[in-house]
Interface confidence: low
């Protein structure tokens, strides 16, 4: 298996191929960057920023009606969320369900085999505690850039201000508060899949200091799912320092969307399943990860797992065959969209309708079976890829026929036999799907019977002969008659007709050669004769 390229590949160009082995259902994928906000406790405000895609997608391929002329597979994806700092108490990092995603951008793509569906980059919010008793501030979250980048807004903790104003008002130029400066700060998390660490960049703030260090030097090589509290942030233009908390998301490559649709049900079902790979739940609190999965136009069908991540299947049944469904699958981290996949799934070919066959006017050993051209009903049945025609008397024989055939001459039949013909149409989708078999019956005409078997002659007395035989292998007709013709010296002597093959011929001439010919008559045709020669004895009296 070839390795997947790391997320360090160029972020200014499109996504690279991800080689895979076992093909999975390829789905047209529209990875839409989240542009949502996370609200902290006490927050009443939500802001939206248009999202920009950042993760590396597998092989991108054109998708009709794409909203963008070219699919950028590696732009940075940002989303911001704002949280109000609660008064006096630290804000826990909870979040509400994210609202919808405005400004979505279509990123056409295909799903690589086995990794399943490409994941969008996360955008995660951090919460920070606030310590100002006198006011609250809006805090923004972050975004992930590079291979996988995520943006969340960080709430900041306000420094305590003196509540005793001076008795005299003096006009002074004061620095901006760091709480105000960092209150709406956007943080870009950049995921390096090669070593599975994150780098956090404080956007639009020059020379940010984390404690006494440059933030640039501090906020890299962050472990996924780590939580960094009370980071003191400031810069030359603000005072006093404020604190922020960072909640580093899981790597987006830890989540993959898999098709779990059983092939047998793929015509009327869609099954999707989020799976995690190498996600350490000891480090990553599964309570922070949830998912939503639903497909349109089945509006009322949704699979939701809130507040804890347990991989499970979401199967939608009773869908229409050969129909496009748009499925939206999201992973949320701390209530903020981390991964979003929009995939177009086409249900498999439907079960075809089988036309009613007509068995025609049979001959003794063949007949023509014909059927009408199928009428295409795209809403339910698919046009057949072929037919299977079977015919049986005692044993069954089947023949596979192409879909451009509407008749078939069944040959090598046995005369005067009842046959049942069954015709079924099939399509080749993920599996061969057979329509319901339609039947017709026929009876072949009679034909000449075979010769009698085991003919024997014996002489019970000097001038009488017994003739016996068994039935032919195939009588090929409705009736059973055995015909015995007795000849002598080339001349006709006598003729018998019986329904069984036991003849007693007496009163023959003594010491005479006779020819005994037995044939079978089936009520329509007489078969060939079997001949035995026998002589009478001299008269012993």
């Amino acid at each position: 298996q070839t390795p997947t390229p790391s997320d360090e590949l160029s972020t200014t160009e499109n996504a690279l191929l991800l080689p895979q082995s076992d093909p999975l259902p390829a789905r047209t994928t529209e990875s839409t960057p989240p542009s949502i906000s996370e609200r902290g406790n006490g927050s009443s405000e939500t802001t939206y920023h248009p999202g920009v895609l950042s993760t590396l997608l597998p092989h991108l391929s054109p998708q009709p009606d794409s909203q963008t002329p070219s699919a950028g597979g590696a732009d940075t994806q940002t989303f911001s969320s704002q949280a109000d700092n609660p008064t006096l108490t630290p804000a826990p990092g909870g979040g509400t369900d994210p609202p919808g995603v405005p400004g979505e951008r279509t990123v056409p793509g295909t799903i690589p085999a086995d990794t399943a569906f490409p994941v969008d980059t996360p955008s995660l919010a951090r919460n920070s505690s606030a310590a100002s008793p006198t006011h609250t501030s809006n805090v923004s979250t972050t975004d992930i850039s590079s291979g996988a980048s995520l943006t969340t807004l960080t709430p900041s903790t306000l420094g305590l201000a003196s509540t005793d104003p001076p008795s005299t008002t003096i006009a002074t130029t004061t620095k901006q508060t760091c709480a105000a400066m960092f209150g709406n700060i956007t943080v870009n998390y950049t995921y390096e899949s090669s070593n599975q660490t994150f780098k956090a960049d404080l956007k639009d703030v020059q020379n940010a200091k984390c404690g006494n260090e440059d933030c640039e030097n501090v906020l890299n090589n962050l472990e996924e799912c780590s939580q960094i509290k009370n980071i003191s942030v400031s810069n030359d233009s603000c005072a006093p320092a404020t604190t922020i908390d960072l909640y580093v998301p899981p790597g987006t490559d830890k989540f993959s969307l898999h098709d779990c649709t059983p092939k047998e049900k793929a015509n009327t079902s869609i099954c999707l399943e989020w799976k995690t790979k190498n996600l350490d739940f000891r480090k990553c609190n599964s309570d922070n990860i949830s998912y939503v999965l639903h497909c349109e136009p089945e509006n009322n069908t949704k699979c939701i797992r809130r507040n804890t991540f347990i991989p499970e299947r979401c199967q939608l049944d009773n869908l229409r065959a050969q129909t496009n469904y748009t499925c939206v699958a999201e992973i949320l981290y701390r209530g903020v969209k981390l991964v979003k996949n929009v995939i177009n799934v086409q249900t498999d070919l439907g079960i075809p309708e089988t036309p009613k066959p007509s068995c025609g006017d049979p001959a003794a050993r063949k007949t023509l079976v014909s059927w009408p051209e199928p009428v295409s009903k795209p809403e339910s049945a698919s046009k057949p890829h072929g037919y299977v025609l079977c015919y049986k008397n005692n044993s069954e024989k089947c023949k596979s026929l192409p879909n451009n055939v509407t008749s078939f001459e069944v040959e090598s039949l046995k005369p005067y036999k009842y046959y049942e013909v069954s015709l079924l149409a099939y399509v080749n989708g993920k599996i061969q799907r057979n329509g319901t078999a339609e039947k017709c019956n026929f009876h072949t005409k009679a034909d000449r019977p075979d010769k009698v078997n085991g003919m024997k002659t014996s002489r019970p007395t000097d001038n009488s002969i017994n003739v016996t035989c068994g039935p032919p292998y195939e009588t090929n007709g409705p009736k059973t008659f055995y015909i015995l013709v007795v000849r002598s010296g080339g001349s006709f002597v006598t003729k018998y007709n019986k329904t069984n093959c036991q003849f007693y011929v007496d009163n023959l001439y003594y010491s005479t050669d006779y020819e005994f010919l037995v044939s079978f008559h089936n009520g329509v045709y007489e078969g060939d004769s079997v001949i035995r020669n026998e002589s009478t004895n001299f008269n012993a009296k």
Epitope: L17, P25, A26, L60, S61, S70, A71, K430
Partner: nanobody, 119 residues
Framework: QVQLVQSGGGLVQPGGSLRLSCAAS????????MGWYRQAPGSQRELVAS??????SYADAVKGRFTISRDYAKNIIYLQMNSLKPDDTAVYFC??????????????WGQGTQVTVSG
């Protein structure tokens, strides 16, 4: 089935150029994504460049030196390799990935072309 036939490659001195081509036959493939991978002895196969829907991507190691292009009419992709380095020595594989309306994707690979950069 898609057949990928690669040509080009060979021995070149450092700083030199080579052009690889990969022709796909058996099925129209305009909607497929195509790319080049390489595998040096003892190493894993790595992505070099890909092109899909007219958009090209490159691995950092080759950016600015290699150019991937695609002739949609002839079902051929090319990899123009300039300023070659000894590190570029590898077997180069053409990759074709197509997506079906039924929902499945398939990968096809070329037979591989040896590129040796040596002084």
């Amino acid at each position: 089935q898609v057949q990928l036939v690669q040509s080009g490659g060979g021995l070149v001195q450092p700083g030199g150029s080579l052009r690889l081509s990969c022709a796909a036959s058996g099925r129209a493939f305009n909607s497929a994504a195509m790319g080049w991978y390489r595998q040096a002895p003892g190493s894993q196969r790595e992505l070099v460049a890909s092109i899909s829907a007219g958009t090209a991507s490159y691995a950092d190691a080759v950016k600015g030196r290699f150019t991937i292009s695609r002739d949609y009419a002839k079902n051929i992709i090319y990899l123009q390799m300039n300023s070659l380095k000894p590190d570029d020595t590898a077997v180069y594989f053409c990759n074709y990935r197509t997506t079906y309306t039924s929902g499945y994707s398939e990968d096809y690979w070329g037979q591989g072309t040896q590129v040796t950069v040596s002084g």
